[in-house]
């Protein structure tokens, strides 16, 4: 008795965070024995899509010509060989930005901060939201969530950083979201450049990259410390 079929690999191009209306292609790569590929979306009542393999049969393409909220979510793929269906791939989380109007990101007391001091990044939305995300460009784990407790919605979230070091310097954006789908995000805020002075400067970072590209491993995730966020918002690492 042969063991279970190896799981396929699932990925999205140009990335897994896609602006509303943009196209995205989901790829599932299995083996040369694959006869059919299936894409399942979490909590969907039926397979999301099924495709015949592309020659030489070791992968399939699932095209989304225009990203909408229908497509946002968590996916897995499978392939069928003559002996049955494979194990599921690791999940792919497809996130859509542009679902809500952009929040405003500011730094208190100032985006110019001295090393060793404190700064708070403030993300404010026009309408009440229950999740706020702060993204530092080029961070390995770019998403830090502040999520409202008990579903209470807020107009803002604070991301305190203390003490500030040179690692905190860089370009930030924030997003807001509703709790019923963490795969639907607002438009990104305008970028905020946090400049840390009074410390030895390392090499300048490379040009900023879109949030839809894969983050490089060189930066540590943003870790604000200090006071607990206000307004009943709870910090979550995702």
């Amino acid at each position: 008795q042969a063991g279970p079929l190896p799981k396929p690999t699932l990925w999205a191009e140009p990335g897994s965070v896609i602006s509303w209306g943009n196209s995205v292609t989901i790829w599932c790569q299995g083996t040369l024995e694959a006869r059919e590929y299936r894409l399942d979306k979490e909590e969907s009542p039926a397979p999301w899509d099924r495709q015949n393999p592309l020659e030489p049969k070791n992968k399939a393409r699932f095209s989304i010509p225009s990203m909408t909220e229908d497509y946002a979510g968590r996916y897995r793929c499978y392939y069928r060989s003559p002996v049955g269906w494979s194990q599921p791939s690791d999940p792919l989380e497809l996130v859509m930005t542009g679902a809500y109007s952009k929040p405003t990101l500011s730094a208190l007391p100032s985006p110019l901060v001295t090393s060793g001091k404190s700064v708070t990044l403030l993300c404010q939305s026009r309408s009440p939201m229950d999740t706020f995300l702060l993204i530092k460009e080029r961070a390995a784990h770019p998403l830090l969530h502040l999520r409202s407790e008990h579903g209470a919605q807020q107009h803002q979230a604070e991301f305190p950083m203390s003490p500030v070091t040179s690692v905190h310097g860089g370009t930030y954006r924030c997003f807001s979201s509703h709790g019923f789908s963490h795969y639907l995000l607002s438009h990104p805020s305008d970028p905020l450049e946090l400049i840390v002075s009074g410390s030895l400067e390392g090499p300048r970072p490379s040009p900023t990259r879109s949030v839809s590209t894969a983050a490089g491993p060189e930066d540590q995730p943003l870790m604000p410390t200090g006071s607990v966020p206000h307004s009943g918002l709870r910090r979550h690492w995702e």
């Epitope: 979306k41 909590e43 009542p45 039926a46 397979p47 999301w48 899509d49 229908d70 979510g73 269906w85």
Partner: antibody, heavy 122, light 110 residues
Framework: QVQLVESGGGVVQPGRSLRLSCATS????????MHWVRQAPGKGLEWVAL????????YYADSVKGRFTISRDNSKNTLYLQLNSLRAEDTAVYFC???????????????WGQGTLVTVSS | DAVVTQESALTTSPGETVTLTCRSS?????????ANWVQEKPDHLFTGLIG???NRVPGVPARFSGSLIGDRAALTITGAQTEDEAIYFC?????????FGGGTKLTVLG
């Protein structure tokens, strides 16, 4: 054209069992998910169960979970519903309905059978 | 358990536009509920109309359209015809099961 024909209904005592069938034609049965839906006399619709195209996933309404089993035989183009431990409140017309090939191809509940009546009575 | 609520009855006239709605007890209807609309005519004749909120079943007249309006799913008949007199059921998906609404009896006064 697409046809769904249910059979197997009848009068049965509480606690007994019954097996319903839904014979299909006019489409590639093995590519589609399938549903059972019921309608009690003078009432609205109640979804009962869903099975995926290959039988790999089944879903049930809480009211029938553990008592009813949905299955299919793709070689015979036939859908089944095994009804065990029947209760008076299971009395209804039972319909099979076609689901989709996939969420991006087709619309659930697009075609329905004419139904088969199950009466649970002592 | 989730409860799906529809208007019990609506009346319209030929040529008028009428909107039927479908509300979920769990909150706003979202794309993840994959709202479906089914028509019942006398003698247990059921026909699917709309799936996935807005996708029309092939062959269903273009006067039938589906959408989300506020926190509800909606079925709009633009230019109702006498043959549209029927009971309309919506169905919503909740992660692992479907739930039908109680149905809306639509009368088209001819």
């Amino acid at each position: 054209q697409v046809q769904l024909v249910e059979s197997g209904g009848g009068v049965v005592q509480p606690g007994r069992s019954l097996r319903l069938s839904c014979a299909t034609s006019g489409f590639t049965f093995s590519s589609y998910g399938m549903h059972w839906v019921r309608q009690a006399p003078g009432k609205g619709l109640e979804w009962v169960a869903l099975i995926w195209f290959d039988g790999g996933n089944q879903y049930y309404a809480d009211s029938v979970k553990g008592r009813f089993t949905i299955s299919r035989d793709n070689s015979k183009n036939t859908l089944y519903l095994q009804l065990n431990s029947l209760r008076a409140e299971d009395t209804a017309v039972y319909f099979c309905a076609r689901d989709v090939i996939s969420m991006v191809r087709g619309v659930p509940f697009d075609y329905w059978g004419q139904g088969t009546l199950v009466t649970v009575s002592s | 358990d989730a409860v799906v609520t529809q208007e019990s009855a609506l009346t319209t006239s030929p040529g008028e536009t009428v909107t039927l709605t479908c509300r979920s007890s769990t909150g706003a209807v979202t794309t993840g509920n994959y709202a479906n609309w089914v028509q019942e005519k006398p003698d247990h004749l059921f026909t699917g109309l709309i799936g996935g909120i807005k996708n029309r079943v092939p062959g269903v007249p273009a006067r039938f359209s589906g959408s989300l309006i506020g926190d509800r799913a909606a079925l709009t008949i633009t230019g109702a015809q006498t043959e549209d007199e029927a009971i309309y059921f919506c169905a919503l998906w909740y992660s692992n099961h479907w739930v039908f609404g109680g149905g809306t009896k639509l009368t088209v006064l001819g």
